[in-house]
């Protein structure tokens, strides 16, 4: 905390300008009026204030706005944003997407900090849902943003926002998250034709149920192995050899290289060896011919 001292004669700041970079910390405290600073925040970012000078400027704003800064100030914080704690940010009411963009720009190139996470949380909660423009903005700055949300938080994403999602935005999503996102994507892309639909839905298929995979197998989609390997094991297991062959098309040959990995390994164990042999890939581990397969889960359901 900077002690209160009188401003030296002739040093009272009439505007926020470059001359202030030569002021000592106590001079900034004594000679810069907090209300002047608040009205000229847009200038602060253009002036190369030192780390400690910025501490003083933040302190002045904190004194002026103990209940939290108004959005007119927040929008122009610039590098002062890096000085804010999550506690500071929780006092804010940020409603403008432009304000959000301005602050994310300051943090660009860095990991998502606790400050940024708090800011986004405040913003999204204020809006009530994660709309398309917000999602567009957040994934542009943080491609992994979507996958940092819990399934509960993802449930507030409207299907219309799914159009903003790029494949790389889903790279770190786990199956639970894709379970929530897939139905939204299916709804969002429902009016597209076959091949276009597959291109859009492909990155979300980690959340697809068996019946949707069966339907896709009838559409000559030629799913690549990387996508197939991300499918839910429980959704892949009921697929027949013929369905998997149709689903993968020319990529079916890749099954051999993946036969020891899930979901391929588990799927092989559920297929008749006869059927696997029809692929001509030398896949081993299927149910030997003549064995009866009992679906115990079905039996339990009936009893």
């Amino acid at each position: 905390e900077v002690e209160k001292t009188a401003c030296p004669s002739g040093k009272k700041a009439r505007e926020i300008d470059e001359s202030l970079i030569f002021y000592k910390k106590w001079e900034l405290e004594a000679c810069v009026d907090a209300a002047l600073l608040a009205t000229q925040m847009d200038r602060v970012n253009a002036i190369p204030f030192t780390y400690e000078q910025l501490d003083v400027l933040k302190h002045k704003l904190d004194e002026l706005y103990p209940q939290g800064y108004p959005e007119s100030v927040i929008q122009h914080l610039g590098y002062l944003f890096l000085k804010m704690s999550p506690e500071d940010i929780r006092k804010w009411n940020v409603t403008s997407l432009e304000t959000l963009k301005a602050l994310l720009e300051v943090n660009k190139g860095h990991e998502m900090s606790p400050q940024v996470a708090t800011l986004i949380d405040r913003f999204v909660k204020g809006r009530g849902q994660l709309d398309k423009d917000t999602l567009d903005t957040l994934t542009a700055f943080y491609p992994g943003y979507l996958c940092s949300l819990s399934p509960e938080e993802l449930s507030s994403v409207p299907p219309s926002s799914i159009w903003a999602v790029r494949p790389q935005d889903l790279d770190t999503c786990d199956p639970r998250q894709l379970d929530v996102l897939y139905p939204k994507a299916r709804l969002a892309f429902q009016n597209m034709n076959g091949s276009e639909y597959f291109v859009k839905i492909q990155s979300f298929l980690g959340g697809a149920p068996t019946e949707d995979l069966k339907a896709l197998s009838q559409q000559n989609v030629s799913m690549d192995l990387a996508t197939f390997m991300k499918l839910r094991t429980d959704a892949v297991l009921p697929l027949t050899v013929a369905e998997v062959q149709k689903l993968l098309g020319p990529h079916v040959e890749g099954l051999k290289a993946e036969e020891r990995h899930r979901p391929v390994r588990d799927w092989i164990l559920r297929q008749r060896q006869d059927d696997l042999d029809t692929l001509g890939l030398g896949l081993q581990g299927g149910i030997p011919n003549g064995y009866l397969v009992l679906d115990l889960s079905m039996q339990e359901a009936l009893s």
Epitope: E18, P48, T50, Y51, E52, Q53, L54, Y79, L82, K83
Partner: antibody, heavy 122, light 107 residues
Framework: QVQLVQSGAEVRAPGASVKISCKAS????????IHWVRQAPGQGLEWMGI????????AYAQKFQGRVTMTRDTSTSTVYMELSSLRSDDTAMYYC???????????????WGQGTLVTVSS | DIQMTQSPPTLSASVGDRVTITCRAS??????LAWYQQKPGKAPKLLIY???SLASGVPSRFSGSGSGAEFTLTISSLQPDDFATYYC?????????FGGGTKVEIK
């Protein structure tokens, strides 16, 4: 790669002015500040001032106030430093150098121009 | 202005030696201190920033330490390429100021 390329050596008579250029490439010009530092023959380094290429704001060390002017041309990513009323003790190597535009914790000079030798002699 | 004082002004050493250069500030500069290496006829080159962070591409034999008003640059095992002049610089407040330099020469 990051480069700051300065204009060639200059010889001036006492009382004259000199204008040196520093052309930036390999980085986003607007995201950095450009500083000017000089070094008299066999001497240490002396900070002259700073310019923000983005807004054009600038600040000069008190010693050079009234004699130095820093300007920029964003269309060519070039910064200029003009020093007037030259004296013999202004004979020095003049360097431009950059620092990132940041929260104040990065005002170290991470890339430097090759230097421009200014000789003041009658 | 903050005065930066380096010692020693000149240092004679041999290849393989451990070399330490000191920089003192006339007032507290926190950790806002950088070190540069300069060879004759060349521009200075950043070695260390924020007192102890190694700049990109700088060999790990260089290290920096200190905070407040006293800082050191250490070269753990002097190499032929390290004979040069070294400068410290504070960026705690304006004007930015440099130490007078320490010339490391061959013994």
């Amino acid at each position: 790669q990051v480069q700051l390329v300065q204009s060639g050596a200059e010889v001036r008579a006492p009382g004259a002015s000199v204008k040196i250029s520093c052309k930036a490439s390999g980085f986003t010009f607007r995201g950095y500040y450009i500083h000017w530092v000089r070094q008299a023959p066999g001497q240490g380094l002396e900070w002259m001032g700073i310019i923000n290429p983005s807004g054009g704001s600038r600040a000069y060390a008190q010693k050079f106030q009234g004699r130095v002017t820093m300007t920029r041309d964003t269309s060519t990513s070039t910064v200029y430093m003009e020093l007037s009323s030259l004296r013999s003790d202004d004979t020095a190597m003049y360097y431009c150098a950059r620092t990132a535009s940041c929260g104040g914790d990065c005002y170290y000079l991470d890339y430097w121009g090759q230097g421009t030798l200014v000789t003041v002699s009658s | 202005d903050i005065q930066m004082t380096q010692s020693p002004p000149t240092l004679s050493a041999s290849v393989g030696d451990r070399v330490t250069i000191t920089c003192r500030a006339s007032e507290n500069v926190n950790i806002w201190l950088a070190w540069y290496q300069q060879k004759p006829g060349k521009a200075p080159k950043l070695l260390i920033y924020k007192s102890s962070s190694l700049a990109s591409g700088v060999p790990s034999r260089f290290s920096g330490s200190g905070s407040g008003a006293e800082f050191t640059l250490t070269i753990s095992s002097l190499q032929p390429d390290d004979f040069a002049t070294y400068y410290c610089q504070q960026y705690q407040s304006y004007p930015l100021t440099f130490g007078g330099g320490t010339k490391v020469e061959i013994k």
